[in-house]
């Protein structure tokens, strides 16, 4: 098991729009139709003002109007919920579809896409119903923008909630070589298909993807627990033939100085098809992007039952070393290295300030907001501090899969 690793199934807590944990000052918009439809009126289930945020401009055809929520700290956002305008039950404005953009630093914005590259999310069919959208893959974000859409000139209004949990790993980005394709009886695509950073010259940098999405792969890397996805989907993999150095090098950037106890790497070991655990791992540490690597690298040779073909989490001790950047080399012990998840066990160094602009107020690991309770068809789960359930039969959730 990935000790200390977050469980995406439990990361579904209301982040504070409905219960006002998110203050008005952290909700903004590109424009508002009037003060009574300002951004602060965009809270799910709220009837404040004229009952929603409504942009001043048309969202057709440009789709440039947005509602922005600042979560103040990095969160894993697993679901979003939307509603139209309340207006004492007389509101007629809602958004049939929308896009999401998100940012971890307030500078670089990424468009959310589902596992098949679709950006447009099905929204509401009426002004009052709440429609929840499972975000597969989830997004690691501090700021989230909702861009309502329309297929003609019309008024749209929006109330929203976000659901997820605090991103306590603190990982801002990882840099890695682009994953490769293995050819068996069918092509096995071992690329990082949800990576949200840049790709240049065979290197991915500045983003997060499948190695940080909480989903660990199966023993047989050709199979996935996700439906309707290609062979190899859960894993990112590299062939020994492509690396004359004999290792794959990755770099990890964190939000602030941390003391690192361990790195956990979920690896495939289906050696009959060429996948092997790394023979060893070597990590270097530094406190800033332009600083020198400090001290001796931490080296860890992997023992254990290498003949056991089951996938497993390998724990690499990091000795409490303090850093904001890690560079790790994973040594080939066979034809292929296949990873499905990498996580870190670390503690924030108390006197360190965050790498992102501004100082963040403390936030609980589980935000206190309960899930919405006005559905008759929620899953049968206790209320209060429980992950939010999907509104059964909601038209939003369109997974292209089996």
């Amino acid at each position: 098991d990935m000790k200390g690793h977050f469980d995406p199934a439990k990361c579904r807590y209301a982040l504070g729009m409905q219960d006002r944990t998110i203050p008005d000052s952290d909700i903004s918009a590109s424009s508002s139709w009037s003060d009574s439809t300002a951004a602060r009126h965009s809270r799910l289930e709220s009837s404040d003002g004229d009952g929603a945020w409504c942009p001043a401009g048309s969202v057709f055809p440009k789709e440039e109007e947005y509602l922005q929520v600042d979560l103040q700290r990095l969160h894993l956002v697993a679901l979003v919920g939307t509603q139209g305008r309340h207006a004492g039950g007389l509101g007629k404005e809602f958004s049939r579809s929308y896009r999401l953009r998100y940012s971890r630093d307030g500078r670089r914005w990424m468009g959310w896409k589902d596992r098949w590259g679709q950006e447009v999310i099905s929204g509401n069919e009426d002004p009052e119903g709440v429609v929840l959208k499972d975000l597969g893959p989830p997004m690691v974000a501090r700021l989230v923008r909702f861009y309502p859409r329309a297929d003609r000139v019309m008024s749209v209004c929006l109330r929203v909630e976000l659901y997820g949990c605090l991103w306590r790993d603190g990982l801002l980005s990882y840099t890695a070589p682009v994953g490769q394709t293995m050819y068996l009886s069918e092509a096995v695509y071992l690329n990082d298909s949800t990576y949200d950073g840049h790709t240049v010259g065979g290197l991915q940098y500045g983003g997060l993807g499948q190695l940080a999405d909480g989903v660990v792969g199966l023993d047989d890397f050709r199979k996935s627990q996700e439906l309707r996805v290609w062979p190899g989907y859960d894993y990112v993999g590299w062939s020994n033939h492509s690396f004359s150095s004999g290792y794959v090098e990755m770099e990890f950037e964190f939000d602030r100085l941390r003391a690192f106890q361990a790195m956990q790497v979920h690896c495939n070991n289906m050696h009959t098809l060429g996948a092997r655990l790394p023979g060893g791992v070597e990590c270097r540490f530094r406190r800033g992007p332009a600083m020198a690597w400090e001290g001796e690298p931490m080296r860890h040779n992997l023992g254990g039952n290498l003949g056991d073909p089951r996938a497993r989490a390998v724990s690499v001790p990091l000795g409490g070393r303090v850093a904001r950047f890690l560079q790790c080399r994973f040594l080939f012990a066979g034809p292929w290295l296949l990873f499905s998840e990498i996580s870190f066990i670390s503690d924030v160094v108390n006197n360190s300030s965050p790498a992102l602009g501004g100082t963040f107020p403390p936030a609980p690991w589980w935000p206190p907001g309960p899930p919405p309770t006005n559905f008759s068809s929620l899953e049968l789960e206790p209320r209060g501090q429980q992950p939010v359930a999907k509104a059964e039969g909601s038209p939003t959730i369109e997974f292209r899969m089996d």
Partner: antibody, heavy 117, light 111 residues
Framework: DVHLQESGPDLVKPSQSLSLTCTVT?????????WHWIRQFPGNKLEWMGY???????KYNSSLKSRISITRDTSKNQFFLQLKSVTTDDTGTYYC??????????WGQGTLVTVSA | DIVLTQSPTSLAVSLGQRATMSCRAS??????????MHWYQQKPGQPPKLLIY???NLESGIPARFSGSGSRADFTLSINPVEPDDVATYYC?????????FGSGTKLEIK
């Protein structure tokens, strides 16, 4: 391995609702996979009815959409089938099963449901 | 909906010989360079059992006597050599498009 077991009444009257439970052991239904209901008619024809995804979303066979509902209770690791307004044509063996991107790898043993007055 | 047509409806093969059965889809079930077609074996009183996934991959624990081939809309399941335990009905199933559909089955008997 994942183990699934169907349970529910074996006789339902026409126009009533059919309700079945699938209890899953050795695996959490919120951790992965899609959790499906499939039925087999007396002539052995197999029909996929719908699923609930591990993330909570549902998808139904359009031929049943107005009558079917699949829900779950994650605390009990169970998922449920409700089929409304049944007729004698709904008689058959009902299976719960799970799938990833490689077909229905795990099946329950099935439960025979007869719709009869 | 994608219709899967299996042929023959029934098949009698001598022990030790090869059995071959076909599944034809009304449209392609390929995507991402792979075929979302799977094969199952069902014996009386039992649920279907996954044999082959994504056209040609042998499910773990299934003997190598079973093999699958094909792409797009034409697929074949072969059993070589046939053994007494193989007497069953064999179904193909596609998961490329909702709703997922099954073929009507091929019943294998021993001559």
């Amino acid at each position: 391995d994942v183990h699934l077991q169907e349970s529910g009444p074996d006789l339902v009257k026409p126009s009533q609702s059919l309700s079945l439970t699938c209890t899953v052991t050795d695996y959490s239904i919120t951790s992965g996979y899609g959790w499906h209901w499939i039925r087999q008619f007396p002539g052995n024809k197999l029909e996929w009815m719908g699923y609930i995804h591990y993330g909570g979303s549902t998808k139904y066979n359009s031929s049943l959409k107005s009558r079917i509902s699949i829900t779950r209770d994650t605390s009990k690791n169970q998922f449920f089938l409700q089929l409304k307004s049944v007729t004698t044509d709904d008689t058959g063996t009902y299976y719960c099963a799970t799938s990833g991107n490689y077909g229905f790898a795990y099946w329950g043993q099935g439960t025979l449901v007869t719709v009869s007055a | 909906d994608i219709v899967l047509t299996q042929s023959p409806t029934s098949l009698a093969v001598s022990l030790g010989q090869r059995a071959t059965m076909s599944c034809r889809a009304s449209e392609s079930v390929d995507d991402y360079g792979t075929s979302f077609m799977h094969w199952y074996q069902q014996k009386p009183g039992q649920p279907p059992k996954l044999l082959i996934y994504r056209a040609s991959n042998l499910e773990s624990g299934i003997p190598a006597r079973f093999s699958g081939s094909g792409s797009r809309a034409d697929f074949t399941l072969s059993i070589n050599p046939v053994e007494p335990d193989d007497v069953a009905t064999y179904y193909c199933q596609q998961s490329n498009e909702d709703p997922f559909t099954f073929g009507s089955g091929t019943k294998l008997e021993i001559k």
